[in-house]
């Protein structure tokens, strides 16, 4: 199985003398999990919010983000035992008031139904039926996600 | 290169506690979670749970969460696991091991095994 | 829990042999499969990842494949090194679990 940059550069090969778009990344990752347009890679290990939000970063990425109940419900779908939680990219902004992704935009709050407080230090995690408002200390896995996103790639003719 | 150090064999009694040590080197201790896995004489293997020991996080095997106990002292790189009320199908080998990537379940490094009898 | 049973649970077989031993799963795990091979007295040793991905300095000889339920350990020549026990894990669910184990025997 070629990884998405072997791919990539097949392609590049095949068109070297013309402008193309393409998606920065093809496909997801080896060991990532296709979820629509995007891509998840569920942890192993526990950690606080904030060192969760720091690992994903490391394979360049972001904690989750979700759009709508729709997502909600399919990322849901993949979650296989019961009792686990997940960090997702959401916490509470105490100057604001509000849930607040980790991309800077807030909450509808028609999207989710979390149980539990908004309040100072709280941030929201994921299981296979629930969301939940739980201490941003609370140490239990996270999902990162990569958006598989076109981006235009100019390929110039060999000099 | 990675070595896994666990401390030595135990005897103990039917309802009593024991705690094994496993002391890591060669690569940075806090940067890798750590799983505890015993064998009984001649079956398989089993997990019984984890610890990251750069926060303290744990995960255990719900079949021993009311007696295990896994904990870290990350100034000598030495994780630990503690069962207690011991019964006699708690005689095994116990292994540390290192998970080899936070995003996927295998363990990459062992140690070489604490035997714990459980003899009245 | 998800049940893994591998077969056979004992093989005799010869230096130079080609061997293969199956994993079946009790529900789909995708491809997070583990084979590690253990020899008396000592820790299991990770030969395998990913159904399929060998650790580093794993011999080439030392093979797997499958998804879903059914996995294969392949070993195209046995070495008298390799003559020792083969678990499969599963890490499709956070509750790790193992095969029984096979035991491989010179014949």
């Known amino acids: 199985q070629k990884s998405s940059i072997e791919k990539c550069s097949v392609d590049i090969q095949q068109s070297r003398n013309k402008t193309t778009e393409r998606p920065g990344l093809l496909n997801c990752p080896i060991y990532w999990q296709q979820l629509r347009e995007k891509c998840l890679l569920f942890s192993h290990t526990v950690n606080p919010w904030n060192n969760s939000l720091a690992d994903c970063s490391t394979k360049e990425s972001s904690l989750l983000l979700i759009r709508d109940k729709d997502e909600l419900i399919h990322t849901q779908n993949l979650i296989r035992d019961k009792a686990i939680l997940f960090w997702i990219g959401l916490n509470f902004s105490l100057s604001e008031k509000n849930w607040k992704w980790i991309n800077g935009s807030f909450l509808n709050s028609n999207d989710l139904e979390i149980r539990g407080d908004a309040k100072e230090n709280s941030c929201i995690s994921i299981s296979q039926t629930s969301v939940y408002s739980e201490y941003c200390s609370t140490e239990i896995r996270w999902i990162c996600q990569k958006e598989l996103t076109p981006v235009r790639n100019k390929v110039y003719p060999d000099s | 290169q990675v070595q896994l150090v666990q401390s030595g064999a135990e005897v103990k009694k039917p309802g009593a506690s024991v705690k094994v040590s496993c002391k890591a080197s060669g690569y940075t201790f806090t940067g890798y979670t750590m799983n505890w896995v015993r064998q009984a004489p001649g079956q398989g293997l089993e997990w019984m749970g984890l610890i990251n020991p750069s926060s303290g996080g744990t995960y255990y095997n719900q079949k021993f969460k009311d007696r295990v106990t896994m904990t870290r002292d990350t100034s000598i790189s030495t994780a630990y696991m503690e069962l207690s009320r011991l019964r006699s199908d708690d005689t095994a080998v116990y292994y540390c091991?290192?998970?080899?990537?936070?995003?996927?379940?295998?363990?990459?490094?062992w140690g070489q095994g604490t035997t714990v009898t459980v003899s009245s | 829990d998800i049940q893994l049973t591998q077969s056979p649970s004992f093989l005799s077989a010869s230096v130079g042999d080609r061997v293969t031993i199956t994993c079946k799963a009790s529900q789909d795990v995708g491809t997070a499969v583990v084979w590690y091979q253990q020899k008396p007295g000592k820790a299991p040793k990770l030969l395998i990842d990913?159904?399929?991905i060998r650790h580093t300095g794993v011999p080439s000889r030392f093979s797997g494949s499958g998804s879903g339920t059914e996995f294969t350990l392949t070993i195209s020549s046995l070495q008298p090194e390799d003559f020792a026990t083969y678990y499969c894990q599963q890490y499709s669910t956070y509750l790790y679990t193992f095969g029984g184990g096979t035991k491989l025997e010179i014949k």
């Open positions: 990913w159904a399929s």
């Open positions: 091991a290192r998970l080899g990537d936070n995003y996927r379940g295998y363990f990459d490094y």
